[in-house]
Interface confidence: medium
């Protein structure tokens, strides 16, 4: 949404000089029962790839109907295809479920591109490769959609894992994760490890490939290296966070940090790209172009419209810069940074015409609804959505794609002053358009 009035932006709020570090309070968070350790049954329970989303197998109804469900931290409805559609191999058949209850209420969800409508009901839901529980959850049975389901994506519904505030038709519709926590002993936390392929996958490879893990109720140490660093959830609607500084190859973009969060910054597994506000996008692209100037790329590449290809195995990763986002830390005046590689922000795609080549799309794009840390960011990290403590944790993913020279990183602490001023306060209007 374009706002007619923009609040005055403060300048000079960048991070302190690198190297000035604050001591961490503790190296690791204290152990909490049921929240850490090994979750073998949940590891590798996701499939898919960043371009079409990551999905988990779920069952709905009695007897159970198995469906693949997109894991989406950027929305809050559990919605499944409930009618034939050319892109669906299967769909939820309410009439076959003895436990389905109709709520006699419709729901409509428009996105920037695409939309769906359906009817609300409740049914019994479980996750075969998740906690051994069954919950009665709200389900939006999608009866009609446009540009929502993706041909060949292999998922038939969406699991919105964000908060009730952005649920449709309103915040009275309890999201799935809230129902899960209320009805079971599952701790109020989940974590995601999305594993980008690093190379294009054809249909048969996607169906056979492992896409990552959604650990429900805990943290699995085997999925990350190094330490987990936490940033506060600013407000419980989307998973909103605050970015306090942005660097391209260590060079500060030197923008008023409010710009980075205009009008919000969210962590969204249902979005492919790293999406940046217009001004930030323009500055970032200018800086990335300058850093990679040894090769010239068409304008369409930077707009995400054109592919660039190199002979198989010769992609010049080294000419592309790393990108660091500094996030507000849990301690006053302390931040930490997450750093991604071109292996994350150049998305491999298959170019039928030149199948011998390695082709990529630039997976950073412009946004009019704030920063969206989509799959290209998340694929570098193990991300902990610690709802109980209102914070999001980042650690280097054990499955992220890198080369022998550089790796994704999560590092801190750094001194950053006046970080609260980096948050943008959205004027109190109806923010329920769910634009993604």
């Amino acid at each position: 949404t374009q706002h007619g009035i923009r609040l005055p932006l403060r300048s000079g709020l960048g991070g302190a000089p690198l190297g000035l570090r604050l001591p961490r309070e503790t190296d690791e968070e204290p152990e909490e029962p049921g929240r850490r350790g090994s979750f073998v049954e949940m590891v590798d329970n996701l499939r898919g790839k960043s371009g079409q989303g990551y999905y988990v197998e779920m069952t709905v109804g009695s007897p159970p109907q198995t469906l693949n469900i997109l894991v989406d931290t950027g929305s809050s409805n559990f919605a499944v295809g409930a009618a034939p559609h050319p892109f669906l191999h299967r769909y939820y058949q309410r009439q076959l479920s003895s436990t389905y209850r109709d709520l006699r209420k419709g729901v409509y969800v428009p996105y920037t591109q695409g939309k769906w409508e359906g009817e609300l009901g409740t049914d019994l839901v479980s996750i075969p490769h998740g906690p051994n529980v069954t919950v009665r959850a709200n389900i939006a049975a999608i009866t009609e959609s446009d540009k929502f389901f993706i041909n060949g994506s292999n998922w038939e519904g969406i699991l919105g894992l964000a908060y009730a505030e952005i649920a449709r038709p309103d915040d009275s519709l309890e999201p799935f994760f809230d129902s899960l926590v209320k009805q079971t002993h599952v701790p109020n936390l989940f974590s995601l490890q999305l594993c980008g392929a690093g190379f294009p996958l054809n249909q048969s490879e996607v169906l056979a490939s492992v896409g990552g893990s959604m650990i429900i109720g805990g943290i699995d140490h085997s999925l990350y290296t190094g330490s987990l660093w936490y940033t506060p959830i600013r407000r419980e609607w989307y998973y909103e966070v605050i970015i306090v500084r942005v660097e391209i190859n260590g060079q500060d973009l030197k923008m008023d940090c409010k710009e980075y969060n205009y009008d919000k910054s969210i962590v969204d597994s249902g979005t492919t790209n790293l999406r940046l506000p217009k001004k930030v996008f323009e500055a970032a692209v200018k800086s990335i172009k300058a850093a990679s100037s040894t090769e010239k790329f068409p304008d369409g590449f930077w707009l995400g419209e054109q592919l660039v290809c190199w002979q198989a195995g010769t992609t010049p990763w080294n000419i592309f810069p790393v990108i660091s986002l500094y996030l507000m830390g849990e301690v006053t005046n302390q931040s930490f940074r997450i750093t991604i590689l071109p292996q994350q922000y150049l998305r491999p795609v298959e170019d039928v015409a030149t199948s011998q080549d390695d082709c990529y799309k630039f997976a950073i794009s412009q946004s009019s609804t704030g920063t969206v840390m989509g799959a290209v960011i998340m694929e570098g990290f193990y991300v902990v959505f610690d709802r109980a403590r209102k914070r999001i944790g980042f650690a280097v993913s054990a499955c992220h794609v890198h080369d022998e020279f550089r790796t994704a990183a999560v590092e801190g602490p750094f001194v950053t002053l006046d970080m609260e001023d980096c948050g943008y306060n959205i004027p109190q209007t109806d923010e329920s358009t769910l634009m993604t």
């Epitope: 009618a83 034939p84 559609h85 409509y108 009866t143 389901f149």
Partner: antibody, heavy 122, light 107 residues
Framework: EVELMESGGGLVKPGGSLKLSCAAS????????MHWVRQAPEKGLEWVAY????????YYTDTVRGRFTISRDNAKNTLFLQMTSLRSEDTAMYYC???????????????WGTGTSVTVSS | DIVMTQSQKFMSTSVGDRVSVTCKAS??????VAWYQQKPGQSPKALIY???YRYSGVPDRFTGSGSGTDFTLTISNVQSEDLADYFC?????????FGAGTKLEIK
């Protein structure tokens, strides 16, 4: 039994208006997208307009866009077609028809009403 | 718009015969084609959807075939009650379009 019954047709002068209704029974009306299809005398079938179950998806054929408005009242199980700026070429039998399955795959018409006749003539 | 062409306006057949009604799309529509029967003074009824799937309650003497641009409705063992107009329809893209119809006459 699944039934659709149109009403509201009649004789109207060019430039005039008419509102057609279609009463549905025997199925959960809000689950289904609904169409209007017309058939000029001794002619073939022509699709006119479509409205989805929740009224969020609405489509028209080019010749009626801007003149006709499709709507529905799910509480009353009724479909409407408001026709304005009528022309002689709008003369036809107007059928309401149910969209099969209410899913995005099958855009054929599985149940048809008996039709209501509209004549536009001076 | 996709044009659906039914080249035969009329077809004459006898009870017990087999008859094929054809329909050609102006561009590829996959299998997104339906066939309807309209008896004199009545509204149309669905016979076939997705080019070859028989609608529930339709006698198995009606079969549909084809994909892409060429489609056929075949009526084997024609009965007197099959006297009707037959229309094809594409639902591959908007606007939804019909063929002009083929009138089946029984000798």
């Amino acid at each position: 039994e699944v039934e659709l019954m149109e009403s509201g047709g009649g004789l109207v002068k060019p430039g005039g208006s008419l509102k057609l209704s279609c009463a549905a029974s025997g199925f959960t009306f809000s689950d289904y997208g609904m169409h209007w299809v017309r058939q000029a005398p001794e002619k073939g079938l022509e699709w006119v307009a479509y409205i989805s179950g929740g009224s969020n998806f609405i489509y028209y054929t080019d010749t009626v866009r801007g003149r006709f408005t499709i709507s529905r009242d799910n509480a009353k199980n009724t479909l409407f077609l408001q026709m304005t700026s009528l022309r002689s070429e709008d003369t036809a039998m107007y059928y309401c028809a149910r969209r099969a399955y209410y899913g995005s795959s099958y855009w054929y018409f599985d149940v048809w009403g008996t039709g209501t006749s509209v004549t536009v003539s001076s | 718009d996709i044009v659906m062409t039914q080249s035969q306006k009329f077809m004459s057949t006898s009870v017990g015969d087999r008859v094929s009604v054809t329909c050609k799309a102006s561009q590829n529509v996959g299998t997104n084609v339906a066939w309807y029967q309209q008896k004199p003074g009545q509204s149309p009824k669905a016979l076939i959807y997705s080019a070859s799937y028989r609608y529930s309650g339709v006698p198995d003497r009606f079969t549909g075939s084809g994909s892409g641009t060429d489609f056929t409705l075949t009526i084997s063992n024609v009965q007197s009650e099959d006297l009707a107009d037959y229309f094809c329809q594409q639902y591959s893209s908007y606007p939804l379009t019909f063929g002009a119809g083929t009138k089946l006459e029984i000798k």
